[in-house]
Interface confidence: low
């Protein structure tokens, strides 16, 4: 019996199969090399091609960059000669591996180039405060085009517990209405999480030193944020509106929200952050007017008036 040559084991033909590929979303920083991976098996040997945003992409024909393309592989690495070259290569990539039996296709690989956020280096002096007094620990994250999330943690990466007395504001600062000796720690760290770049950066730790006192002096409330007595802001129709009031004092003040011009739209209002934040979902024309926060304790009160003007989006 004669077995045709093409039926011998090592001559069996196989259609292409993608065996390795880059993750579907990939973020590169300005100084990073760009490496896109695509490996495939198949007999006869597969040929590779790439598309970027649906258009044929030939890495080796790109100008002003050095390209290393692995032999017998679809993978390639692009190295730039300036700090901003990665921006040029943003897009959606796809690898195609073909032989005479067919074509296998990688998933879409979205390549995003981002500037690496950095906190300016600074020397953070210890913050010294007497028990019962108020204090604000600043965060001041670097500016970012994308939304970021702020966390305050200690060096053990445990969240700083927040309550009526200790609050993080929308601006990222950590506010203490009054400090206790138990707040005495050398490692208050503000973390900024930039989701789009999968990056967390952290500020230098702040050393909060609380001096014990025999008798804490009661203080009537004072607003730490906003600091003035009133403010005017414009809200866009259909968008959410967030108002915030953070107070200091001893005993710890409580916050109430009032609307002198009419009833609060209870079905669309939520109070967060131990009542320090009022969020109005989907602003309408009828939400125009004054919103007042009132910080109260046994010694008195402090207030802030927000004058809201609603405009068409």
């Amino acid at each position: 019996i004669q077995i045709p040559e093409e039926y011998e084991g090592h001559h069996v033909m196989e259609p292409p199969v993608i065996t390795e590929q880059s993750p579907r979303r990939l973020v590169v920083f300005p100084t990073d090399d760009i490496s896109l991976k695509c490996e495939a098996s198949g007999k006869p040997e597969v040929q590779f091609r790439w598309t970027r945003d649906g258009v044929h992409f030939k890495p080796k024909e790109e100008l002003g960059v050095t390209v290393y393309q692995s032999p017998h592989s679809g993978s390639f690495t692009i190295t730039g000669n300036n700090s901003n070259f990665a921006q040029r290569f943003q897009g959606i990539y796809r690898c195609f591996a073909s032989n005479k039996l067919g074509t296998a296709m990688s998933h879409e690989i979205r390549l995003m180039a981002e500037g690496a956020p950095k906190w300016p280096k600074e020397t953070v002096k210890p913050v010294e405060v007497e028990e019962g007094e108020s204090v604000v620990l600043p965060c001041n994250p670097p500016p970012s085009a994308e939304p970021l999330r702020i966390y305050w943690m200690n060096s053990k990466i445990l969240h700083i517990k927040q309550d009526e007395r200790v609050t993080m504001g929308q601006n990222g600062n950590l506010y203490f209405a009054n400090v206790l000796t138990s707040d005495n720690h050398s490692d208050y760290i503000c973390h900024a999480h930039f989701p789009g770049t999968r990056t967390i950066i952290q500020k230098e730790p702040i050393d909060l030193r609380v001096k014990a006192t025999n008798s804490m002096i009661d203080r009537k409330p004072r607003l730490l944020f906003p600091t003035n007595s009133s403010s005017h802001l414009v809200a866009l129709q259909g968008q959410p509106l967030v108002l915030e009031c953070i107070a200091e004092g001893f005993p710890t003040p409580t916050i109430k929200w009032l609307r002198p011009s009419g009833p609060m739209p209870a079905d669309r209002v939520t109070y967060q952050n131990h009542n320090k934040t009022l969020q109005l979902l989907k602003v309408g024309e009828e939400d125009d007017g004054e919103y007042r926060c009132l910080a109260e304790n046994s010694l008195g009160s402090a207030r802030h008036a927000y004058y809201v003007t609603v405009e068409a989006a």
Partner: antibody, heavy 118, light 113 residues
Framework: QVQLVQSGSELKKPGASVKLSCKAS????????MQWVRQAPGQGLEWIGE????????NYNEMFKSRAVLSVDTSVSTAYMQLCSLKAEDTAVYYC???????????WGQGTLVTVSS | DIVMTQSPDSLAVSLGERVTMNCKSS????????????LAWYQQKPGQPPKLLIY???TRESGVPDRFSGSGSGTDFTLTISSLQAEDVALYYC?????????FGQGTKLEIK
Amino acid sequence: QVQLVQSGSELKKPGASVKLSCKASGYTFTSYWMQWVRQAPGQGLEWIGEINPSNGRTNYNEMFKSRAVLSVDTSVSTAYMQLCSLKAEDTAVYYCALYDGYYAMDYWGQGTLVTVSS
Amino acid sequence: DIVMTQSPDSLAVSLGERVTMNCKSSQSLLYSSNQKNYLAWYQQKPGQPPKLLIYWASTRESGVPDRFSGSGSGTDFTLTISSLQAEDVALYYCQQYHSYPFTFGQGTKLEIK
């Protein structure tokens, strides 16, 4: 704080459709992909698909591609999942989950139980 | 699709003891360019949604106790609880997010002996 609140339980007959909602608050709705995952009684977790609320872009598990439709209404920060041609084996708790920048699902809704029975 | 296989299916461990559970993927989850493994671990208690414990195979989610740790690279991963507490009784799932469709392991049920 981030919250995902899902619609209530549903009882459906085989062949029917169901549309579940997931209302998001406490973050910028258009910033993160929304995932849908299901869990049949006593079973493991199964990924259905995801939607990018900023542009409506979707990715589906092939298993569900012909029957599931993901959508969003950014004006009310709500994501929806519609599943049609329901079968008894679609009885499950359906979760929406937020896909943070770390590419893992770090916030989840409380789940919606869908029961398919004749 | 990438297949995730967890072992064991269930285990019973005494309080205070060390717990290890494994997760194996059918293909590598390591992306060489950023040296990240695209793997997460979740904890699920009855009647609750899953809770993220670990992402990128070894990075603990903020607020998760430091007795939980993740290790491994490529195709073999481990979740370790250094000292079992009563509140750790739950189902644990691994999940890959390297390639579509995302896939989960079948789960490991952890009980107290």
